[in-house]
Amino acid sequence: AWELTILHTNDVHSRLEQTSEDSSKCVNASRCMGGVARLFTKVQQIRRAEPNVLLLDAGDQYQGTIWFTVYKGAEVAHFMNALRYDAMALGNHEFDNGVEGLIEPLLKEAKFPILSANIKAKGPLASQISGLYLPYKVLPVGDEVVGIVGYTSKETPFLSNPGTNLVFEDEITALQPEVDKLKTLNVNKIIALGHSGFEMDKLIAQKVRGVDVVVGGHSNTFLYTGNPPSKEVPAGKYPFIVTSDDGRKVPVVQAYAFGKYLGYLKIEFDERGNVISSHGNPILLNSSIPEDPSIKADINKWRIKLDNYSTQELGKTIVYLDGSSQSCRFRECNMGNLICDAMINNNLRHTDEMFWNHVSMCILNGGGIRSPIDERNNGTITWENLAAVLPFGGTFDLVQLKGSTLKKAFEHSVHRYGQSTGEFLQVGGIHVVYDLSRKPGDRVVKLDVLCTKCRVPSYDPLKMDEVYKVILPNFLANGGDGFQMIKDELLRHDSGDQDINVVSTYISKMKVIYPAVEGRIKFSTGSH
């Protein structure tokens, strides 16, 4: 028998520095977690102790903190090289700055193979990107070879900016011939490494003949066997065992997100490459693991540029940006409008001639807007200003919801109106009218939404049975501020870009902004 140790990360999202337990900015260092310096300590410890070790990343290193905003992927290549990753799969967020924003900082600089079997380049891009990412790689480990085959969510064109010269194929259809090739090369130990979410990971384990292990990402799935060491609630045991269609037991793993855990899976193979046993658990990277001093010093060196960036002007406002709780928790506020407009603008994807855009709606809990911005400072807006407005380090995500769920969400928005509570929704691409004289749960009297399948966008009444795409904070997608109906009833959830980054990009693009209060949210006569 031959034993392989797979160390894995996914959805690190720019958390190069240690973070608090909830993966936001580290405040009390003695209770902070993760970060590349701490990760390196643990990886090196395992490499020294065990003979056959692979360090793999399942995508979405890009996007999530000011590190990505400033360094645009160069930080990912630099620190992944320093940690000596063996391979990485492309995630959807790796395309956030377009194909060029992937090629130059990451693909050309990474000292490890970057993989995806279901992304096919065409046109002029085909020769430009040739060899910079691969469908699979055969890695030598000890006296054996291990095949790693990559995959990426086929929804990427709706979630990011891959352009028109990359085709995202069905994962299973694309993976099978590549796995067959590996088998033809006498490679009998094969890992599928990719970024399509836990449901697809399980399908790959079930359907792709020859895959021995699946290491996934995208859905931030936490798996654990035994008592979990932190706040994350396991979605199943680690590894999650899937019985393939040809009767094999295939371990499937994922390691939550944000570099909080290091996935640790031990696989035993027989001489024919069959998995005999698999066991392990994610390792919580808490403060009991010291940060590696040389990596930490490097982080501190790179950090300097971030501090300078946060005080630079992004753009100007010529109006007061009202982000006060007195406004945003009671009525339409122009800060809410600005943020929602930025959220929609960030998700412009012309992927179908029938649609002017794939999504037109935004909702945003008023309690998530934490500060106004005064225009009487020469109109200057900095990253620092935006960090006061959006201090929680969240993301603006894409969900699919039925009209009936949206209606419930808007009823929840005003179910206890007047108490300055955070659930009051700010909107974009939505016109809502409330009648507060009616009883809670029956206060939405008009709810019109902006069409997407139209050449001239206009507002139509919400249809209860129709499925709509909506951009919203991850906080709401996870049921925060009492929006349990969103969490329970959402049909799809894809994590998006860092909230501050979305707004800062929009302001930089617009240069001068002047958001108004324009009647998106109304109260019917006599009720307010």
């Epitope: 990474a110 000292k111 490890f112 790689k137 055969v138 030598p140 033809t184 090369l185 006498n186």
Partner: antibody, heavy 118, light 107 residues
Framework: QVQLVQSGAEVKKPGASVKVSCKAS????????IYWVRQAPGQRLEWIGW????????KYNEKFKGRSTLTADKSASTAYMELSSLRSEDTAVYYC???????????WGQGTLVTVSS | DIQMTQSPSSLSASVGDRVTITCKAS??????VAWYQQKPGKAPKLLIY???TRHTGVPSRFSGSGSGTDHTLTISSLQPEDFATYYC?????????FGQGTKLEIK
């Protein structure tokens, strides 16, 4: 463009050692195998072994195990092949080559002639 | 080790001819066969891998076929620059092995 540039011709006495270098450029050195292949006069090509610069893993053809040493200097993007206890039948052109994606040889160095003669 | 045997060892042909070179493996190598062209004093050049996939920049007159133990390289219409020695290689398992070569000469 991918280039592999090898060191110059060598003449060695039986029992001596030779070290041939292969300087890579035009791609990320750590991401592809470097293979060593030799060709004795009028003979077929013979695979000596590989080194994978990413993790410095080495695999030898059993025939060359013990006499051949493959190394790589990542910072210089250079691979080396040393052959010891040379005999006259080791007279050959030694090539380094790079894979496309494992097991076939897509790009070749220009070759280094090693002559073993007393 | 897998032995690769090429035939013929040499052959003479004219410009415009269709030429076929065969390679027999001592055991099943599936479709894991590559073909190389070598000219005197030069390094070999990859023509084909995976039995029938042409390497970048290789003219379409070169094609490969076969599976299992029997593999073939075909040049559909010989050009003056095609006169050289051709080698097959199995990339199925280590040690990777080559055929003894087929020398293609001008008739």
């Amino acid at each position: 463009q991918v280039q592999l540039v090898q060191s110059g011709a060598e003449v060695k006495k039986p029992g001596a050692s030779v070290k041939v270098s292969c300087k890579a450029s035009g791609y990320t050195f750590t991401n592809y195998y470097i293979y060593w292949v030799r060709q004795a006069p009028g003979q077929r090509l013979e695979w000596i072994g590989w080194i994978y610069p990413g993790n410095l893993n080495i695999k030898y053809n059993e025939k060359f195990k013990g006499r051949s040493t493959l190394t790589a200097d990542k910072s210089a993007s250079t691979a080396y092949m040393e052959l010891s206890s040379l005999r006259s039948e080791d007279t050959a052109v030694y090539y380094c080559a790079r894979d496309d994606n494992y097991a076939w040889f897509a790009y070749w160095g220009q070759g280094t002639l090693v002559t073993v003669s007393s | 080790d897998i032995q690769m045997t090429q035939s013929p060892s040499s052959l003479s042909a004219s410009v415009g001819d269709r030429v076929t070179i065969t390679c027999k493996a001592s055991q099943d190598v599936s479709t894991a066969v590559a073909w190389y062209q070598q000219k005197p004093g030069k390094a070999p050049k990859l023509l084909i891998y995976w039995t029938n996939t042409r390497h970048t920049g290789v003219p379409s007159r070169f094609s490969g076929s076969g599976s299992g133990t029997d593999h073939t390289l075909t040049i559909s219409s010989l050009q003056p620059e095609d006169f050289a020695t051709y080698y097959c290689q199995q990339h199925y398992s280590t040690p990777f092995t080559f055929g003894q070569g087929t020398k293609l000469e001008i008739k």
